[in-house]
Interface confidence: low
């Protein structure tokens, strides 16, 4: 009779994490007598997966009834597969011996590859806010996937980004992998409502990629534009001066009125109006008693926005002339509209 052969017909088996793997093995003869054992890996460090003779293997079931005398099918099923189960599995025939059974013949091995879904991508932005025209970096991380092949894309408001670098670790063989990507995004003034999306596509996701998002409202700072104007007289000796603070984000803003360099009043932006682009407008007014001043008054509206250096705009109030509507006169430390950052 021909010598027994152990046949593992599948060179490799691919299984999704959480599913059951079937590892096939058949023998060509009933002789010699002895048990079958399954191992992961070869050599002295191999791991016992199943022993027909003894032991408790809760995740393993046999495909056929191994107690039947004429059984030559030693295939097994391993349930609830995880990436840690990946490896090469060997079906090994032992010959009955005393005191121990002796290894007789091994199959060629079946490589079990586990398809594990990537974790939901986590997108994180810079620690500090940045102003429009700054380039900021966003990172995206996803873990625990297998096989290694994966596609990552970045989008800003549906438009695909091209300036990013992606690494998949580890470089060599592993039971599962992680991806890390850094994208550079140039902020624009309209980005308060914008979103950055990291999209991960993997064979396990069946064409339905995972997405992680970051709202640029957490990242952007739009500096305010200031305009100081003098309103018509409210009373014979009173002039109303307003400071319009426009198109800023976030809302955190403190305004200080200075009269000839001396602090007159400080207030925090509270009842703001929101523009359609997500930025805010706010107006503060100062009632100036002209009769209390002998000389011309320099009124300065000084704004500290989101902890940044103060910007200010000034208005010269002529007290010598009869108080009436005057144009906006701007002698300021920071002049011009503050709508586009230039760093």
């Amino acid at each position: 009779e021909e010598e027994l052969q152990v046949i593992q017909p599948d060179k490799s088996v691919l299984v999704a994490a959480g599913e059951t793997a079937t590892l096939r093995c058949t023998a060509t003869s009933l002789i010699p007598v002895g048990p079958i054992q399954w191992f992961r890996g070869a050599g002295p460090g191999r791991e016992l997966i199943y022993n027909q003779k003894e032991g408790h293997f809760p995740r393993v079931t046999t495909v056929s009834d191994l107690t039947k005398r004429n059984n030559m099918d030693f295939s097994i099923r391993i349930g609830n597969i995880t990436p840690a189960d990946a490896g090469t599995y060997y079906c090994v025939k032992f010959r009955k011996g005393s005191p121990d059974d002796v290894e007789f013949k091994s199959g060629a091995g079946t490589e079990l590859s586990v398809r594990a879904k990537p974790s939901a991508p986590v997108v994180s932005g810079p620690a500090a806010r940045a102003t429009p025209q700054h380039t900021v970096s966003f990172t995206c991380e996803s873990h625990g996937f297998s096989p290694r092949d994966i596609t990552l894309k970045w989008f800003k408001n549906g438009n695909e980004l091209s300036d990013f670098q992606t690494n998949v670790d580890p470089v060599g063989e592993s039971v599962s992998y992680s991806i890390h990507s850094t994208a550079k995004v140039v902020l624009t003034r309209e980005d308060v409502h914008s979103q950055v999306i990291c999209e991960v596509a993997h064979v396990t996701l069946q064409g339905d990629p995972l997405r992680g998002t970051a709202n640029l409202s957490e990242t952007i700072r739009v500096p305010p534009t200031l305009e100081v104007t003098q309103q018509p007289v409210r009373a014979e000796n009173q002039v109303n001066v307003t400071c319009q603070v426009r198109k800023f984000y976030p809302q955190r803003l403190q305004l200080t009125w200075l009269e000839n360099g001396n602090v007159s009043r400080t207030e925090t932006a509270s009842t703001v109006t929101e523009n359609k682009d997500g930025t805010y407008n706010w107006m503060s007014w100062l009632l100036v008693n002209v009769s209390a001043h002998r000389d011309d008054v320099k009124l300065t509206c000084q704004v500290e926005h989101d902890g940044q250096p103060a910007v200010s705009k000034s208005h010269d109030l002529k007290v010598s002339a009869h108080p009436k509507e005057q144009g906006s006169n701007t002698a300021a430390e920071n002049t011009g509209s503050n709508e586009r950052n230039i760093y």
Epitope: Q133, T135, P223, P309, G336, N338, R340, I342
Partner: antibody, heavy 131, light 103 residues
Framework: VTLDESGGGLQTPGGALSLVCKAS????????MGWVRQAPDKGLEFVAG???????????TYGAAVQGRATISRDNGQSTVRLQLNNLGAEDTGIYFC??????????????????????WGHGTEVIVSS | AVTQPASVSANPGETVKITCSGS???YGWYRQKSPGSAPVTLI????KRPSGIPSRFSGSKSGSTNTLTITGVQADDEAVYYC??????????FGAGTTLTVL
């Protein structure tokens, strides 16, 4: 608003030219200024831009074709902007237009740049580089 | 880079749209009647019209595409239309120009 360019004419290859734009009709120091040129039978090409703001991280910018050869400067007192272009070649032949932007920059921010915000053009001065 | 069509044509009275695509947030539109003549600004900062420019010229932006719309095209509108913007280094860029032919 008027922008009057001068300094064009026949130039020698390898030589240098200096174009001056005299501006009037607006508060010159508050606006970004630039130079745009047009080679014969070609489109518009950005040459250089200069911005307001004393310490802006952005003070001058240059087109790729003139980078390293051009210098743009402004004199707010005289309301002039000057373009110096060295090592002239035949590809520098064309009409050079002075441009005014719709706004300017502070030390921290801009409300206008150059090519997206031009609101006034000069009539142009012709430069011919030939031996 | 800035991309715009090489040419467009329209009958008098029609509406014509000229597109310009790039990566910038802001665009300007400039008209040149003949090569070498001074361009005229039609639109700056996407949608702002200088004084003296008729309201039939308008600009709009959607995504990375900017559009110049001319309603009620006239024979006098025949010209080359350029769009301009800035790259991320603030260097100006102009499109190659779109020739408008009024049929």
């Amino acid at each position: 608003v008027t922008l009057d360019e001068s300094g064009g004419g026949l130039q020698t290859p390898g030589g240098a030219l200096s174009l001056v734009c005299k501006a009037s009709g607006f508060t010159f120091s508050s606006y970004n200024m630039g130079w745009v040129r047009q080679a014969p039978d070609k489109g518009l090409e950005f040459v250089a831009g200069i911005y307001t703001g004393s310490d802006a991280g952005l003070s001058t910018t240059y087109g790729a074709a003139v980078q390293g050869r051009a210098t743009i400067s402004r004199d707010n007192g005289q309301s002039t902007v000057r373009l110096q272009l060295n090592n002239l070649g035949a590809e520098d032949t064309g009409i050079y237009f002075c441009t005014k932007s719709a706004g300017g920059c502070s030390d921290y921010n801009c409300d206008a740049y150059i090519a997206d915000s031009i609101d006034a053009w000069g009539h142009g001065t012709e430069v011919i580089v030939s031996s | 880079a800035v991309t715009q069509p090489a040419s467009v044509s329209a009958n008098p009275g029609e509406t014509v749209k000229i597109t310009c695509s790039g990566s910038s947030s802001y665009y300007g539109w400039y008209r040149q009647k003949s090569p070498g003549s001074a361009p005229v600004t039609l639109i700056y900062d996407n949608d702002k019209r200088p004084s003296g420019i008729p309201s039939r010229f308008s600009g709009s932006k959607s995504g990375s595409t900017n559009t110049l719309t001319i309603t009620g095209v006239q024979a006098d509108d025949e010209a080359v239309y350029y769009c301009g913007n800035e790259d991320n280094s603030y260097v100006g860029i102009f499109g190659a120009g779109t020739t408008l032919t009024v049929l």
